[in-house]
């Protein structure tokens, strides 16, 4: 039990969110962090993985409505599969219809998240800021 | 002890955030919520107060760096005191130097928060979206 160091009691009127890595944003029990340093998609993915997280996965407009207000463009975990033309997440799941509107910024197989649930296609080797996400159980 | 219903153990590698009102954003133990419906400043303040919160107070670029990425304009808890020309928060504290860049949108005594720590002066009776904030102890 050595990893645990706190016991907290939670009032019914309020709730704790998490657990998340320290100083990450917690919303509806998902953890998010925005990273300022620009990396290409592969480096961004590696950075998230090193923190036991993945690049942003958009799975619900309701549970992730905080993403509506995000400014600028950031790598997310969505990649194009040229063989069948589909877009899929790092975990292999296919992008659901009407979750994101995908627009070509330039030819590429990776996607940047932009406000209001838009995704912009970009060359995977271009450096951009990125969003990591960790889903709590 | 009737208000409490959970006991949780927190690993040292991760941490819980809060407590916050249900479905609010928690970041560095502050709680934030963005409200879509447009209200004037006074109605926005009343809405936050009804939820045991206040309009957004910007007190630290470090602790509130998530605000850098906020898109659009939203009422915050900053008002102009015509008698001495200062800007102060709802709790009576004076706006610290270099925290916000204040820009006149139009003549007024209230301020909208915009990305990258900018504040836009606006007529208090104009409807806008708003940000409520609750500081955890």
């Amino acid at each position: 039990n050595s990893l645990f160091n706190q016991e907290v009691q939670i009032p019914l009127t309020e709730s704790y969110c998490g657990p998340c890595p320290k100083n990450w944003i917690c919303y509806k029990n998902n953890c998010y962090q925005f990273f300022n340093e620009s990396k290409n998609w592969y480096e961004s993915q590696a950075s998230c993985m090193s923190q036991n997280a993945s690049l942003l996965k958009v799975y619900s407009k309701e549970d992730q409505d905080l993403l509506k207000l995000v400014k600028s463009y950031h790598w997310m975990g969505l990649v194009h599969i040229p063989t069948n033309g589909s877009w899929q997440w790092e975990d292999g799941s296919i992008l659901s219809p009407n979750l994101l509107t995908i627009i070509e910024m330039q030819k590429g197989d990776c996607a940047l998240y932009a406000s209001s649930f838009k995704g912009y296609i970009e060359n995977c080797s271009i450096p951009n800021t990125y969003i990591c996400m960790q889903r709590t159980v | 002890n009737s208000l409490f219903n959970q006991e949780v153990q927190i690993p040292l590698t991760e941490s819980y955030c809060g407590p916050c009102p249900k479905n609010w954003i928690c970041y560095k133990n502050n709680c934030y919520q963005f409200f879509n419906e447009s209200k004037n400043w006074y109605e926005s303040q009343a809405s936050c107060m009804s939820q045991n919160a206040s309009l957004l107070k910007v007190y630290s670029k470090e602790d509130q760096d998530l605000l850098k990425l906020v898109k659009s304009y939203h009422w915050m808890g900053l008002v102009h005191i015509p008698t001495n020309g200062s800007w102060q928060w709802e709790d009576g504290s004076i706006l610290s130097p270099n925290l916000l860049t204040i820009i006149e949108m139009q003549k007024g005594d209230c301020a909208l928060y915009a990305s990258s720590f900018k504040g836009y002066i606006e007529n208090c009776s104009i409807p806008n979206t708003y940000i409520c904030m609750q500081r955890t102890v």
């Epitope: 033309g85 589909s86 877009w87 992008l95 219809p97 009407n98 994101l100 509107t101 995908i102 627009i103 070509e104 910024m105 330039q106 030819k107 209001s116 649930f117 838009k118 912009y120 296609i121 060359n123 | -």
Partner: antibody, heavy 121, light 108 residues
């Protein structure tokens, strides 16, 4: 087979309004973005507006922004274009077209036959 | 905003190859789509994503795209290919669809 049928065109005075409709069939309407493209007499194609499958995202050409509103009713498989404050330069054949990729704004795979809008006093 | 430049007209004899260009700043980094519009008819997509053909479009129609120029090539031109041809891209910076001015293909 994909079918797109525009209606609602006609003669209108400058400053007036008109609402175009596009009835769609032969595909799952709600997952495809739809667009309006116009063509003035003897001129080239000009994009007007596009709307995502869910209706969450709308984009407009600068020439119509603030005057035209694109919308859709996915329960009726119908696309609309509300045109207000019409000008003589809005005179054109208006085509509705279906996006070629269900998840992406890319190209226009299917087109209707068009409806003529004439703005004149 | 992004601009696409096409020659107003191209003429070719039947059986020859027609090449219609579409110029734009670094257009090779964008996916280009081509439409054919015959007189009095609605446009028809003939090439998308630079070089892919929709079903029903003859193999004689092909596309390429690099640098600052995209090209629609029509080999073994037939009289029925006489039409206006338009290139199109998405400008992701402005969230606008952009069409070229169109090229009238005349079969001599």
């Amino acid at each position: 087979e994909v079918q797109l049928l525009e209606s609602g065109g006609g003669l209108v005075q400058p400053g007036g309004s008109l609402r175009l409709s596009c009835a769609a069939s032969g595909f799952t309407f709600s997952i495809y973005a739809m667009t309006w493209v116009r063509q003035a007499p003897g001129k080239g194609l000009e994009w007007v507006s596009i709307i995502s499958g869910s209706g969450d995202h709308t984009f407009y050409a600068d020439s119509v922004k603030g005057r035209f509103t694109i919308s859709r009713d996915n329960s009726r498989n119908t696309l609309y274009l509300q045109m207000d404050s019409l000008r003589a330069e809005d005179t054109a054949v208006y085509y509705c077209a279906k996006e070629g990729k269900w998840v992406q704004l890319s190209h226009f795979a299917n087109w209707g036959q068009g409806t003529l809008v004439t703005v004149s006093s | 905003s992004y601009v696409l430049t096409q020659p107003p007209s191209v003429s070719v004899a039947p059986g020859q190859t027609a090449r219609i260009t579409c110029g734009g700043n670094n257009i090779g980094s964008k996916s280009v789509h081509w439409y054919q519009q015959k007189a009095g008819q609605a446009p028809v997509l003939v090439v998308y994503d630079d070089s892919d053909r929709p079903s029903g479009i003859p193999e004689r129609f092909s596309g390429s795209n690099s640098g600052n120029t995209a090209t629609l090539t029509i080999s073994r031109v037939e009289a029925g290919d006489e039409a206006d041809y338009y290139c199109q891209v998405w400008d992701g910076r402005s969230d606008h669809v952009v069409f070229g001015g169109g090229t009238k293909l005349t079969v001599l």
